[in-house]
């Protein structure tokens, strides 16, 4: 009888532990990646930003992978994705090639299985950065809720990368899992 | 035998209740604080906004504390932090000393143990607000995922506080816990 | 004796399943709605955007309802709400009626019980879109944490709807439930 009770309890405990494992708040993947200022591309064209910190300052990652400039999903789920991108220019940095700028960010998803890239979110503004002002600044914030599959990759593209603000509080992106896929 | 079963069940229930307590969705801390735009001091390029509503309109708080103008963390965890700051000026409000403005927000974290302040997120824009237009408006939104420890404090600093939009739907900040720290 | 044990286990399982149901990550409502470009209103006045995709591209919905241009809450809770709205104009689209624009978004909550509408979040900017530039672009992002009751409705209002960017990565809004109401 006592053996039977223990077997029953093990069944209950087994499923309970399974639930605990699945619903435990610590199990949820996340990442917050901050720009690596030593490796920002030059120019005014649209480029993919491949150098980010995931293990210093505010940068952190758990149950996701950062590789080749991309944030890789390891766990299927619905994620909230966000990006904050700051651009700035000071007159001491020299003249701008043009006063009319497109300051843009694109958050893209790439699937390895089907080698294609899709823009999940975009944001930005056209700006007139006149020489009458000694300093110019502009920030973009985007965020949204997306279904991501294991192996899919998130990357950030911007225009005018040479104008990026290299501070960790200025230029970053991230993700956190909110729920499983049904 | 029956007593033994109850003891076994109590063990299961005990751990189950412990899980329930830990994973229960209602246990998660959050705050959404809306601006109280009265009596904002001047004297520095950016000023800390110390007066916020947490118990009226959209303002609310649970398992966090609001004190001395700061949002205090009571529970270790990873939190999503956000801020929305709106600036506006109407010609009837009087003049501006300059058309070139820096409209900025800084979300800062202060640790009491190590009395230092760090900027987690910043955003904003330089703006040219000409007197040729009767009304000007600009909003900033920032958000990010951060590890916060009990006792740490979140505060908001802005430039040009006299230009803040005092509506509760315009100028606010908040946080909600997403997951525990491993 | 064996029957008694099963009854005890059923009690444990019953409450456990109840917890599982309540805390299960998949049970949480969400929506990500992308603009339906075929049905964008014209004009420059403030209008409610009623046509959104919830079942194609990035658009998706679960445990919430989309009806009559509104996102309807089916489950009480605290939700994170967000919106990203992009405006653009190219000189090939013809002249603007005015170069001074207010590009705004308002995220509103309507309660059927008390037929009233309240703005939860607003954002935007006044812009000077001069004819000197062939292309203009501007994006707004807002987000915040709000208590929503079953039956309440979320809608999006914008100024200058004819300038909206119709891409699914540009103009969207969404919500996901974070926690229950105590």
């Amino acid at each position: 009888g006592s053996q039977h009770i223990r077997a029953e309890k093990a069944m209950v405990d087994g499923s309970w532990l399974d639930l605990a494992k699945r619903s435990k708040l610590e199990a949820q993947p996340f990442a917050h990646l901050t720009i690596n200022a030593t490796d920002i591309p030059s120019g005014s064209h649209k480029v993919s930003l491949s150098s980010w910190y995931h293990d210093r300052g505010w940068g952190k990652i758990s149950n996701m992978t950062f590789s080749n400039g991309k944030l890789i999903v390891n766990q299927d789920g619905f994620y909230y994705l966000y990006a904050n991108i700051c651009f700035r220019h000071h007159e001491t940095s020299g003249d701008l090639a043009t006063e009319y700028l497109q300051l843009m960010v694109y958050v893209t998803k790439t699937s390895i299985k089907i080698p294609s890239s899709h823009t999940l979110m975009k944001g930005g503004s056209t700006k007139y950065w006149s020489g009458n002002s000694e300093f110019h600044f502009y920030s973009i914030n985007v965020g949204g809720f997306f279904k991501l599959r294991s192996g899919e990759e998130i990357s950030i593209e911007v225009s005018n990368p040479s104008l990026l603000d290299p501070d960790q509080d200025a230029t970053y992106f991230g993700a956190f899992k909110v729920r499983d896929i049904d | 035998g029956s007593q033994h079963i109850r003891a076994e069940k109590a063990m299961v229930d005990g751990s189950w209740l412990d899980l329930a307590k830990r994973s229960k969705l209602e246990a998660q801390p959050f705050a959404h604080l809306t601006i109280n735009a009265t009596d904002i001091p001047s004297g520095s390029h950016k000023v800390s906004l110390s007066s916020w509503y947490h118990d009226r309109g959209w303002g609310k708080i649970s398992n966090m504390t609001f004190s001395n103008g700061k949002l205090i963390v009571n529970q270790d965890g990873f939190y999503y932090l956000y801020a929305n700051i709106c600036f506006r000026h109407h010609e009837t409000s009087g003049d501006l000393a300059t058309e070139y403005l820096q409209l900025m927000v800084y979300v800062t974290k202060t640790s009491i143990k190590i009395p230092s302040s760090h900027t987690l997120m910043k955003g904003g824009s330089t703006k040219y607000w000409s007197g040729n237009s009767e009304f000007h408006f600009y909003s900033i939104n920032v958000g990010g995922f951060f590890k916060l420890r009990s006792g740490e404090e979140i505060s908001i600093e802005v430039s040009n506080p006299s230009l803040l939009d005092p509506d509760q739907d315009a100028t606010y900040f908040g946080a909600f816990k997403v997951r525990d720290i491993d | 004796g064996s029957q008694h044990i099963r009854a005890e286990k059923a009690m444990v399982d019953g409450s456990w399943l109840d917890l599982a149901k309540r805390s299960k990550l998949e049970a949480q409502p969400f929506a990500h709605l992308t603009i339906n470009a075929t049905d964008i209103p014209s004009g420059s006045h403030k209008v409610s955007l009623s046509s959104w995709y919830h079942d194609r591209g990035w658009g998706k919905i679960s445990n919430m309802t989309f009806s009559n241009g509104k996102l309807i809450v089916n489950q009480d809770g605290f939700y994170y709400l967000y919106a990203n709205i992009c405006f653009r104009h190219h000189e090939t689209s013809g002249d603007l009626a005015t170069e001074y624009l207010q590009l705004m978004v308002y995220v509103t909550k309507t309660s059927i019980k008390i037929p009233s509408s309240h703005t939860l979040m607003k954002g935007g900017s006044t812009k000077y879109w001069s004819g000197n530039s062939e292309f203009h672009f501007y994006s707004i992002n807002v987000g915040g944490f709000f208590k929503l009751r079953s039956g309440e409705e979320i809608s999006i209002e914008v100024s200058n709807p004819s300038l909206l960017d119709p891409d699914q990565d540009a103009t969207y809004f969404g919500a996901f439930k974070v926690r229950d109401i105590d």
Epitope: - | D95, A97, G131, S159 | -
Partner: antibody
Framework: EVQLVESGGDLVKSGGSLKLSCAAS????????MSWVRQTPDKRLEWVAS????????SYPDSVKGRFTITRDSAKNTLYLQMSSLKSEDTAMYYC????????????????WGAGTTVTVSS | DTVLTQSPATLSVTPGASVSLSCRAS??????LHWYQQKSHESPRLLII???QSISGIPSRFSGSGSGTDFTLSINSVETEDFGVYFC?????????FGGGTKLEIK
């Protein structure tokens, strides 16, 4: 050296007009708001007019609104005050002052003052 | 308009003494108050900004305090060059206004 030099003050009849000038040097004139402040014979100070750095904002107290006009010429680094329909109560020492602020562009303190120019309105 | 009332109108002191000059606002102006000194036959000179911030080049014996409606300019150990008229000015609300002044004279 940062300097403001006013000129144009004179004795004028009630109802008459006068234009004051202020030459700025030693700083980037186009990046500062400017103002005129007057000191009445009883030594009270009164703000009279302000203009933004780019010249698109101007403001006046009710006492001079509609009669005084502040302008600037950044190419010449010069500030002007055109006064018309002058009254005896406009009699004062007129100072040109640089407007500054730290926190908000709506703020105003005067960190550089000229030596002043005297305006006397006789009835 | 915000009215600034300075007191006393005249203050007679001997060099070496410490003095406090008052400026009271008709409504709260936070810390948007500035102090000026004007010596005889000279133009005003900025001393203190935002109630308590000292200006570069101004002697450290000058200090300011206060917030809301009540403000004080203190001079620690008055020197002969400090005699003149002191004005306060608010920038909290338009139009910008000055106090009537306090004349600091030698006793």
């Amino acid at each position: 050296e940062v300097q403001l030099v006013e000129s144009g003050g004179d004795l004028v009849k009630s109802g008459g007009s006068l234009k004051l000038s202020c030459a700025a040097s030693g700083f980037t004139f186009s990046r500062y708001g400017m103002s005129w402040v007057r000191q009445t014979p009883d030594k009270r100070l009164e703000w009279v007019a302000s203009i933004s750095s780019g010249g698109t904002y101007t403001s006046y107290p009710d006492s001079v609104k509609g009669r005084f006009t502040i302008t600037r010429d950044s190419a010449k680094n010069t500030l002007y005050l055109q006064m018309s329909s002058l009254k005896s109560e406009d009699t004062a020492m007129y100072y040109c002052a640089r407007r500054n602020f730290i926190t908000s562009a709506t703020d105003c303190y005067f960190d550089v003052w000229g030596a002043g120019t005297t305006v006397t309105v006789s009835s | 308009d915000t009215v600034l009332t300075q007191s006393p109108a005249t203050l007679s002191v001997t060099p070496g003494a410490s003095v406090s000059l008052s400026c009271r606002a008709s409504q709260s102006i936070s810390n948007n108050l500035h102090w000026y000194q004007q010596k005889s036959h000279e133009s005003p000179r900025l001393l203190i900004i935002y109630a308590s911030q000292s200006i570069s080049g101004i002697p450290s014996r000058f200090s300011g305090s206060g917030s809301g409606t009540d403000f004080t300019l203190s001079i620690n150990s008055v020197e002969t060059e400090d005699f003149g008229v002191y004005f306060c000015q608010q920038s909290n609300s338009w139009p910008f206004t000055f106090g009537g002044g306090t004349k600091l004279e030698i006793k």
